[in-house]
């Protein structure tokens, strides 16, 4: 679970009383609103490891919409546009964290979630293993 | 704010009493423990769009450690090692969800907040505008 | 605990058709997992039949198994199929369902199988 | 369709010996290929994958070398547990409509 740091002037959560449960706001701040968007952008489609995205949906989560990545080639992509499979283009991927209703289909009772999730894909030299 | 399917066996959450919290369970359940953790290992030393990865901590958040990647390079690895300025190796981002201690130091009370992370790098062809 | 358990097995009549099911349990299909196919005839070697992307729901086969062999998958019930059409005699086997062994986004299951269910029989004799 | 063609396809060695089984492809695969072992009456169990990388678990008597169409794995001493039958697999794929993962026929290693 999490590290919860005491603090006087808060109820104890250390109490054998005290929930595993804590209160979350759902108006979500959003601290990027400001910042220049230029993101991932078309960047799926200009790298040397190319990918897709796919819809993950999933009404008991929140987020329910999840973009994953997926890598075109096992290689990587020359600049006469060839794939070059001496090279591996693999995903990069993150754990983030969901929302998860629980129990099932209520609105107001969530429990926290880490999944992995693939974010986009780069190219990488192999690993070769050498034979003593 | 998320959007909340109505479910007859749940509170009512459309009460104008009901508050604009839900009840989060801390105990996080990870979907991929299970799985075989190949992740982005080291991805980050191999890739032709080599990245650090810089972490940024701050206890009023969950989680309170989010590793943030930072491209080494504005060009890219060739084998050879040197590298390539025709080409561009750029952080690939993602918004994610985390939760905001509210009021802050209270340890069971958080807003949930969207930041944009910078998870890792990727080997792009440069945009080249040409003047008419 | 992470497994498969393979069922619809069994005795099929020379022109029928058959539906294995393979539930996995210990893991959840969300996201990309390569989920695979594979058969042994009676003393013979290893045959690959094909597998499907339970992320995007695509599906690579055998030139052999084209046509005749269709994988889907179920992610709610966290579960894969294989019907087979048009069974012949040379389709006896034990057939297994197997997990690609890198999980999420990789461009084809180019990993390996690291997961392997028990096996179902499937008899195809009139 | 690519085709895998292991060799021997049977061996007979004792326990300490050096093994060593062959595995070709028909055109190139480039480092896409895997080695599993199976005993009799069970599941095909995965030992190496990328030609060279050994799966968590299995005993560093085990590796893989190989590239292209010409691969090789190696059991450096042999013990008891590891007379069984042993398959490589090609991984590769060029496209959705290109796609193989062919088995070898196996090779089945014997107590001498």
């Known amino acids: 679970g999490i590290a919860i740091p005491r603090n006087s002037g808060c109820p104890n959560s250390e109490d054998k009383n005290f929930p595993r449960t804590v209160m979350v706001n759902l108006n979500i701040h959003n601290r990027n609103t400001s910042t220049n968007p230029k993101r991932s952008s078309d960047y799926y489609n200009r790298s040397t490891s190319p990918w897709n995205l796919h819809r993950n949906e999933d009404p008991e989560r929140y987020p329910s919409v999840i973009w994953e990545a997926k890598c075109r080639h096992l290689g990587c992509v020359k600049a006469d546009g060839n794939v070059d499979y001496h090279m591996n283009s693999v995903p990069i991927q993150q754990e983030i964290l969901v929302l998860r209703r629980e129990p099932r289909h209520c609105p107001n009772s969530f429990r926290l979630e880490k999944i992995l999730v693939s974010v986009g894909c780069t190219c990488v030299t192999p690993i070769v293993h050498h034979v003593a | 704010g998320i959007a909340i399917p109505r479910n007859s066996g749940c509170p009512n959450s459309e009460d104008k009493n009901f508050p604009r919290t839900v009840m989060v369970n801390l105990n996080i359940h990870n979907r991929n423990t299970s799985t075989n953790p190949k992740r982005s290992s080291d991805y980050y030393n191999r890739s032709t769009s080599p990245w650090n990865l810089h972490r940024n901590e701050d206890p009023e958040r969950y989680p309170s450690v989010i590793w943030e990647a930072k491209c080494r390079h504005l060009g890219c690895v060739k084998a050879d090692g040197n590298v390539d300025y025709h080409m561009n190796s750029v952080p690939i981002q993602q918004e994610i969800l985390v939760l905001r201690r509210e009021p802050r130091h209270c340890p069971n009370s958080f807003r949930l907040e969207k930041i944009l992370v910078s998870v890792g790098c990727t080997c792009v062809t440069p945009i080249v505008h040409h003047v008419a | 605990e992470v497994q498969l358990v393979e069922s619809g097995g069994g005795l099929v009549q020379p022109g029928g058709s058959l539906r294995l099911s393979c539930a996995a349990s210990?893991?959840?299909?969300?996201?990309?997992?390569?989920m695979c196919w594979v058969r042994q005839a009676p003393g013979k070697g290893l045959e690959w039949i094909g597998c499907i992307d339970t992320g995007d729901g695509t599906t690579y086969y055998a030139s052999w198994a084209k046509g005749r062999f269709t994988i889907s998958r179920d992610n709610s019930k966290n579960t894969v199929y294989l019907q087979m059409n048009s069974l012949r005699a040379e389709d006896t086997a034990v057939y297994y369902c197997?997990?690609?062994?890198?999980?999420?986004?990789?461009?084809?299951?180019?990993?390996?199988?690291?997961?392997w269910g028990q096996g179902t029989l499937v008899t195809v004799s009139s | 369709d690519i085709q895998m063609t292991q060799s021997p396809s049977s061996l007979s060695a004792s326990v300490g010996d050096r093994v060593t089984i062959t595995c070709q492809a028909s055109e190139s695969i480039y480092r896409y290929l895997s080695w599993y072992q199976q005993k009799p009456g069970k599941a095909p169990k995965l030992l190496i994958y990328l030609a060279s990388t050994l799966t968590s678990g299995v005993p560093s008597r085990f590796s893989g070398s190989g590239s292209g169409t010409d691969f090789t794995l190696t059991i450096s001493s042999l013990q008891p547990e590891d007379f069984a039958t042993y398959y490589c697999?090609?991984?590769?794929?060029?496209?959705?409509?290109?796609?193989?993962?062919?088995f070898g026929g196996g090779t089945k290693l014997t107590v001498l």
């Open positions: 210990g893991f959840s299909f969300s996201g990309f997992y390569y």
């Open positions: 197997a997990r690609d062994a890198a999980y999420g986004g990789y461009a084809y299951p180019a990993h390996g199988m690291d997961l």
């Open positions: 697999q090609s991984n590769f794929g060029t496209a959705s409509t290109t796609y193989y993962n062919t």
